[in-house]
């Protein structure tokens, strides 16, 4: 049967009793070998009477003495079987054996849970030689036990390739409960139940769990570990912890904050990164996410012009990267821009509105009703047009660009003329006779050159021809107008 020694009990002797024969318990050991680091089993020289046999492995020596008496079987003496002590206390236990002096080179090693202890352990082997046998006491001490020292310790001795194994000494280190699972911080939906888990172990067992919410005990009566607390829902942030109790005392888990998911705060610092005639690149700093990740954002754009109809354009985008290019805007226009973002709970309020303007752009349409005719008397081509609609000028007109291409007998020559914004007519000199002149006109703003009008062709005859009718931009459908006189 396993004998038990509690830490409160009287100290047990180094070995169970005095060795028979001449060895007294107060003898000074002949040889004492401490092993602090890199434990090496002690060499054994000498012998003594063996102790009584036990349940561990036994070696039966085959050697006989001069009188031909066979030697009794070798075995470790019984010692305390179970030591219970508190964490951080010191403990010392030992194995003892008496070995006939005829044996040389015997070694004792300590093993824990099937693995040899080779590290920085305090093992000391002491030898008490006598005429026929040597009493060997292998002591093992731990100055401040930890939970990791829990286990089954045995001594092993090798003699003539035989292994003698002692009975196990069970070390049970008791202490305050130790958490193996603590509650975790969570973000939860308002008024929705959720679970928290707490688990702690001894020894000693059992470990009982109390839950604490905002410093109030949730359960008057503890639950055996592990414990799952179903929280019926929260309306505001709460802090939870669990207390683990055993016979040694209590350990309190970390306190975890449970947050209530809410709609996000509005974005802040909406700013203009870049403006073009038809787009504005904006960025923003997201507000507090309401303990729930942002899903997407909405950019709201309305014309700042007091005469506009006040309609709002909405552009949806992903929450990252807090950047969006608003497109399809009018040039040289003022806009109010606001940003709102959403999480699983809902949409934030809109950020403070900011004012932004698009720049001038190149006109989006060409001048209209382009008309070309030949003024023979002055040897000029007269061109007339109507300026594009103001809305489609996309800026302030600074003038027009006229392209005229002269083609005759395999020769082609393009010339460009710049004309000021005042008026809607121009006169260009005839470059080549007996040739076709093709005219196109584009409106120009500081934002650039707009599209050219459809080409208008006029034939310039050789000198002496009369009666020139004008040529004009064709009605839709006539792709390549030409005037033949």
């Amino acid at each position: 049967a396993i004998t038990e020694a509690r830490e409160e009990a009287k100290p047990y002797p180094l070995f169970p009793g005095p060795f028979p024969g001449s060895l007294q318990t107060d003898h000074t050991p002949l040889l004492s070998l401490p092993h602090a680091s890199g434990y090496q089993p002690a060499l054994m020289f000498s012998p003594t009477q063996p102790g009584r046999p036990h349940t561990g492995n036994v070696a039966i020596p085959q050697v006989t003495s001069v009188e031909s008496k066979p030697l009794p079987p070798l075995a470790f003496k019984h010692t305390v079987g179970h030591i219970i002590l508190s964490e951080h206390k010191g403990v010392k236990f030992n194995c003892s054996i008496s070995v006939p002096n005829i044996y040389q080179d015997t070694t004792i090693s300590w093993w824990k849970d099937g693995k040899e202890l080779l590290g920085a352990h305090h093992a000391i082997t002491q030898f008490y030689p006598d005429d026929e046998v040597t009493a060997i006491i292998a002591s093992f001490s731990i100055t401040s036990v930890q939970r990791s020292d829990n286990g089954s310790y045995i001594c092993k001795m090798k003699i003539n390739n035989e292994e003698i194994v002692s009975d196990p000494i069970y070390i049970e280190v008791q202490g305050l409960p130790h958490f193996t699972k603590q509650p975790e911080s969570m973000n939860v939906t308002r008024n929705t139940a959720f679970n928290l888990t707490c688990q702690a172990v001894g020894p000693p067992e059992p470990v009982n769990i109390f839950w604490v919410q905002n410093s109030s005990r949730v359960n008057e009566q503890p639950e055996k570990s592990p414990s799952v607390l179903t929280v019926p829902g929260l309306t505001e942030m709460a802090v939870f912890s669990c207390e683990a109790h055993n016979d040694k005392g209590l350990t309190v888990s970390k306190g975890v904050q449970i947050n209530i998911k809410a709609i996000p705060s509005p974005p802040t610092e909406v700013s203009i990164r870049n403006s073009t005639a038809h787009s504005i690149l904006i960025s923003w700093v997201p507000g507090f996410d309401g303990y729930s990740p942002f899903r997407n954002c909405s950019i709201q754009v309305k014309e700042a012009d007091p005469l506009s109809n006040g309609s709002v354009m909405i552009f949806n985008t992903s929450a990252l990267p807090h950047l969006y290019q608003i497109k399809q805007l009018q040039a040289l226009a003022n806009y109010s821009i606001g940003v709102s973002c959403m999480n699983e709970i809902g949409w934030s309020a809109v950020s403070p509105w900011i004012l932004a303007s698009t720049t001038e752009g190149a006109p989006s349409v060409a001048p209209l009703n382009v008309t070309v005719f030949l003024n023979e008397s002055s040897d000029n081509v007269d061109i007339r047009w109507m300026k594009p609609p103001t809305k489609q000028q996309d800026g302030e007109l600074v003038g027009y660009r006229i392209s005229h291409v002269w083609q005759s007998a395999g020769i082609s020559k393009e010339l460009l003329e710049e004309v000021g914004q005042n008026g809607s007519r121009a006169r260009i000199s005839v470059q080549v006779h007996n040739a076709t002149c093709t005219v196109r006109i584009a409106a120009v703003t500081r934002g650039g050159v707009g599209p050219f009008s459809d080409p208008v062709k006029i034939f310039i005859p050789a000198h002496g021809w009369v009666d020139y009718a004008p040529s004009s931009t064709p009605a839709p459908g006539n792709a390549d107008p030409v005037l033949i006189i």
Epitope: Q221, P232, G233
Partner: antibody
Framework: QIQLVQSGPELKKPGETVKISCMAS????????VTWVKQAPGQGLQRMGW????????TYADDFKGRFVFSLETSANTAHLQINNLKNEDTATYFC???????????WGTGTTVTVSS | QIVLSQSPAILSSSPGEKVTMTCRAS?????MHWYQQKPGSSPKPWIY???NLASGVPARFSGSGSGTSYFLTISRVEAEDAATYYC?????????FGGGTKLEIK
Amino acid sequence: QIQLVQSGPELKKPGETVKISCMASGYTFTTHGVTWVKQAPGQGLQRMGWINTYSGVPTYADDFKGRFVFSLETSANTAHLQINNLKNEDTATYFCARTNNYRYFDVWGTGTTVTVSS
Amino acid sequence: QIVLSQSPAILSSSPGEKVTMTCRASSSVSYMHWYQQKPGSSPKPWIYATSNLASGVPARFSGSGSGTSYFLTISRVEAEDAATYYCQQWNTDPPTFGGGTKLEIK
């Protein structure tokens, strides 16, 4: 089916002792505390205290310290309330209740009426 | 200890009406429980942790509130709802009950 069945009505004289029982069934008795609640005639509910059915440790509300004793007979899944040196103001119906998390009394006993009269 | 005040003390209502009774706490609490008691009977658990209906409680009942103000609402009162309703807080020892609201049906 979870239930708490209480002993029958009692008629006592001032100075006497009464012992009320509350027998639990349908659940593991030692996992939930038992709370005792007093309801005087025409009055509201007043928690007298509770007993830990696992450890047997009783806790008394301030107004119920001294003459009142909570005890257990765990083998019979039964909690007891004993009132010593009865007074007229002890006339009331006494309820036992199972205590759940958040001190929610999720199962109530049938009630025991104690009348103290000379 | 936390004192719970229930109002009104007596509430008179006709079938089909919506009624709300209030429980105010002298200090903030995180949950409120409610119990229903009919004359000559034991109290019955009615609403757990502010808003969770106990087993068998009709869906016309609801609970709400936070901090120091909690409410029990019946969307359409029925004759069988006539009873006294008690609120109870758990946060602070000792757990305390309100004085009750008696619901009468005309």
